[in-house]
Interface confidence: low
């Protein structure tokens, strides 16, 4: 008939596999258990996918690579304590005192419980990585943590390459045996340990337990190094960058650890599964019971086939391994699960140009020199639509595009962003808003959804944010509806009037020119050029103030531009900012200050655009330690990757704005990335491409 | 310093109209606009309109029938007036003026009006 | 129009005592909202633009939060000379609108 196998990764749980099946038996529990003798989890898991075995015990992290490499899903749950469930919080915790947050853990003493532990390594490490507070270039996580934070305790790091700086708070038993071992003897190992080690003043920052400040504070611990100690002198360090008391876990923690669950294969039962078991808990999970499930001192061990802790277990309903694991703890695990052994040795980067490849080789020869990995390698391609072909073809790896770009990349091709360029705060050319401004002083005020009819004033055809952010935003939103695709001369016909200058007037609506003005002397109306005084941003924001349209669609930094001074000219000599306000898509307006929350769409920065299959945080730690290297325009080292000059031409792999490379954070979809109007208004244009 | 000083009636019969002059000093009425607010026990504070450096106005739509708002920058001053008051018009009114990027940063000091026979 | 509700209507609180007023919106209003106190007799008094930015020459223990529809006006340590009336103002639409106040007095 039916039987379950289970694995067992030890002699010992071999052992108490063979007893339990034996006490099912024995009991009449249906369908029959038995085991399997796996060397290792991950082993296990391959038995598990390969028929050979049905199921087994894992914990987080475990869960993650069995759902994410093997299709393997969690049925049931463990519980430990009736206050959190399925469920404990990994917490960072730093003296009341400090001022230490989130954002400046870089250089901070660190304690953790041990190497590879869940809540004192794994989360905390992979949730820096992940949100790109830590970089790791070549999956080297342990150099990455040893040279991020200021020295630390992690017990069990001794046996490695940076024992120097990862044990190097950590002191040992009384007689300082034992330094740095992943054993008692290590005063500062395990989660008191860690917490030991922030309190007496070692460290300044523990990754431990959301009960770990609770349990051994406030008279509640016997060593006389706790005693002393108040729950209240310590804090707990938000994800928001903000700080909470030590009883707010629920809200302040860097991840929801998940209890460990029983996985399957996808094909199996996962009902049948919970009955067998919950039929064993029932008869054995309490005191005097011939077999005891959850204990494990009769075979000399801890946690043999399910936690000692565990009160009982739970059929899982969502079965799949994202869903147990919860966003937190799954986005720490992508930040820290980087196999060396799978990383390519190469990084291709596509390349557009004579000059650009003279750059990019280049860069490979700075970046081998300094041993940066994963090397990079040059491919040239056509265009950026060739390059996306060719990462799609897995040809190439990665390539950095602008917003249009990279909206094509994302949608057509499925590439994702894997690190962004940064421009200077006061640098507006590169990363903007556009917005749609209009005189405060109209006694017949209107909104954005009232603009049909009225006057407008355009920097010029196809211009970011004058013409293809706004003209796309109100055909997304209904305003504007072209007929066979034909939007010029829709927006034609929703405008009143117009000035819309153009290089190229074939064919072109006559009311799209009418409000323009041409030069001093009357010439060259319309013109897509500087002839033309309403052309450009600030020429589109004069239409607007004398009074030729109602609505000027410029960029955010237009009107302080161009008023309380800062443009001498005189039609702009009196103006000021003020006097103006912006429409927003809310139906609101606002005051031109106002620009960030009321604007049509934000121009994106650049991206690196990679296949969804490659790491992310290995092509921006590769990024990050040549930026430090390479990334200032005046460093000594042989190589500027932010400057072009050398080669006779701009923007060469990077924009030459860049001030330096930044990780994508939440933004891990071309959509997160380019920001929602952005992609509503390329969509209202790209719906009309017939 | 800036200073928003008002003058006008405090007793006005129903159905008459109301007028109250704002005259500002500190500042130019060409470069900001004055807004008037009431305050009345029933209604609390209620903006009622403004008019703007340029002489345009824009008014509460609840008042917009019985409301006009002009001004003489020569003089530095603002006229408020308001038709057909009944007894619930009664308020303090007050004329306010922004402050750059401050909503309401200065005030007049508020003229009681009492609507009675 | 937006409606600004304001909770509680009344607080009574002895002075040192630490207070936080609060303001709800009808709809999101981003951070347009303002905060002014009255006291007897006299004009409002502009305490805290833009939900969250001070105003030169208030008091540092007047602070304001809040972004969309809910926020709050804090007082550290209230002083005697705190209580009066205070009400919150959008500017995020027009007509522009008050709250109906919340009123702090002395326990």
């Known amino acids: 008939g039916m039987e379950v196998r289970w694995c067992a990764t030890s002699d010992p749980e071999q052992h108490k596999c063979g007893n339990m099946s034996e006490a099912f038996r024995e009991a009449g529990i249906q369908p029959s258990l038995l085991c399997v003798r796996g060397t290792s989890a991950d082993h296990c898991v391959q038995l598990i996918a390969a028929q050979e075995a049905d199921a087994i015990t894992l914990d987080g992290g475990a869960i993650y690579e069995a759902g994410k490499e093997h299709g393997l899903k969690p049925v049931v749950g463990e519980v430990y304590d009736q206050e959190v469930g399925t469920s404990y919080y990994a917490v960072a915790v730093v003296r009341r005192s400090s001022h230490v947050t989130i954002d400046t853990l870089k250089g901070v003493k660190s304690c953790h419980t041990g190497i590879n532990r869940t809540v004192g390594w794994n989360v905390p490490v992979g949730y820096l990585v992940e949100s790109g507070r830590l970089s790791v270039m070549g999956c080297d996580v342990l150099k990455a943590v040893s040279d991020y934070f200021g020295g630390s305790c992690v017990p069990g790091a001794g046996e490695t390459s940076y024992s120097e700086s990862l044990c190097r708070l950590c002191r040992g038993d009384s007689s300082g045996e034992g330094v740095c071992d992943k054993s008692p003897l290590e005063r500062y190992y395990d989660y008191s340990g860690a917490f030991r080690c922030l309190a007496e003043g070692a460290g300044d920052v523990a990754f431990v337990k959301h009960s770990t400040v609770l349990e051994n504070t406030d008279g509640k611990t016997l060593p006389s190094w706790g005693q002393a100690l108040l729950s209240q002198d310590f804090e707990l360090l938000c994800r928001d960058g903000s700080r909470a008391d030590v009883t707010e876990w629920r809200q302040c923690h860097l991840a929801r650890v998940p209890a460990h669950a029983v996985v399957v294969r996808a094909d199996t039962d996962g009902g049948l599964i919970f009955r067998l078991l919950n039929e064993g808990q029932r008869l054995f999970s309490h005191e005097g019971s011939s077999f005891q499930m959850f204990s494990s001192e009769a075979y000399g061990q801890k946690d043999l086939l399910f936690k000692d802790s565990t009160s009982e277990l739970v059929p899982i309903a969502t079965q799949t391994y994202e869903a147990w694991l919860g966003h937190e703890y799954l986005h720490a695990m992508k930040g820290l699960l980087c196999d060396p052994n799978r990383l390519p040795p190469y990084l291709r980067w596509c390349v557009l140009s004579t000059p650009e490849i003279q750059k990019c080789g280049d860069m490979a020869v700075a970046f081998r020199r300094q041993r940066l990995k994963p090397e990079i390698q040059c491919v040239s391609a056509k265009s950026p639509q060739h390059c996306m072909e060719r990462i799609q073809a897995e040809q190439v790896d990665a390539v950095t595009l602008s917003g249009e770009d990279i909206y094509t990349a994302g949608k057509t091709y499925g590439l994702v962003p894997a690190a962004g360029e940064h421009y200077a705060p006061e640098d507006s050319s590169n990363s903007y808003y556009v917005v749609a401004v209009v005189r405060r002083d109209s006694s017949h005020a209107f909104t954005l959804d009232e603009l049909r009819g009225k006057r407008s004033c355009h920097a010029g055809f196809g211009s970011p944010a004058g013409w293809d952010v706004p003209v796309g935003a109100l055909i997304q939103r209904g305003f504007i509806r072209p007929k066979d695709c034909d939007v010029l001369t829709a927006v034609s016909e929703f405008f009143n009037a117009s000035c819309v200058p153009v290089n190229n007037p074939k064919n072109y609506p006559s009311s799209l020119c009418a409000l323009c003005v041409g030069d001093e002397q009357g010439r060259n109306k319309c013109v897509g050029n500087s002839q033309e005084r309403y052309y450009g941003y600030r020429g589109a924001f004069r239409c607007l103030v004398e009074n030729a349209g109602d609505v000027a669609f410029v960029r955010h930094t237009t009107v302080f531009d161009n008023t309380n001074g800062h443009n001498s000219e005189p039609w702009a000599a009196e103006l000021r900012s003020e006097d103006y306000e912006l429409l927003c898509p809310n139906g609101a307006r606002a005051e031109v200050s106002q620009f960030a929350a009321c604007n049509l769409a934000q121009i994106p920065p650049h991206a690196v655009m990679v296949r969804p299959d490659t790491n992310i945080f290995t092509v921006y730690g590769l990024l990050d330690k040549a930026q430090d290297l390479f990334g200032d325009d005046h460093n000594k080292n042989g190589f500027k990757m932010f400057d072009s000059s050398n080669y006779h031409g701009q923007d060469l792999l990077f924009k030459d704005a860049t001030v330096r490379a930044v990780p994508v954070g939440e933004k891990t979809t071309y959509r997160g990335w380019l920001g929602l109007d952005y992609v509503a208004a390329l969509e209202g244009m790209s719906s009309q491409q017939c | 310093q800036v200073q928003l000083k008002q003058s006008g009636p405090g007793l006005v019969q129903p159905s008459q109209s109301l007028s109250i002059t704002c005259t500002v000093s500190g500042f130019s009425l060409s470069s900001y606009g004055v807004h008037w607010v009431r305050q009345s026990p029933g209604k609390g504070l209620e903006w009622l309109g403004v008019?703007?450096?340029?002489?345009?106005?824009d008014y509460n739509a609840a008042f917009i029938s019985r409301l006009s708002i002009s001004k003489d920058n020569s003089k530095s001053q603002v006229f408020f007036k308001m038709n057909s008051l009944q007894a619930d018009d009664t308020a303090i009114y007050y004329c306010?003026?922004?402050?750059?990027?401050?909503?309401?940063?200065?005030w007049g000091q508020g003229t009681l009006v009492t609507v009675s026979a | 129009d937006i409606v600004l509700t304001q909770s509680p209507a009344t607080l009574s609180v002895t002075p040192g005592d630490s207070v936080s007023l609060s303001c709800r919106a009808s709809q999101g209003i981003s951070n347009n909202l303002h905060w002014y106190q009255q006291k007897s007799h006299e004009s409002p008094r502009l305490l805290i633009k833009y939900a969250s930015q001070s105003i030169s020459g208030i008091p540092s223990r007047f602070s304001g939060s809040g972004s969309g529809t809910d926020f709050a006006l804090s007082i550290n340590s209230v002083e005697t000379e705190d209580f009066g009336m205070f009400f919150c103002?959008?500017?995020?639409?027009?007509?522009?609108?008050f709250g109906a106040g919340t009123k702090l007095e002395l326990k």
């Open positions: 306010a003026r922004r402050n750059n990027s401050a909503w309401f940063a200065y």
């Open positions: 103002q959008q500017s995020n639409s027009w007509p522009l609108t």
């Open positions: 008019i703007w450096s340029g002489g345009n106005t």
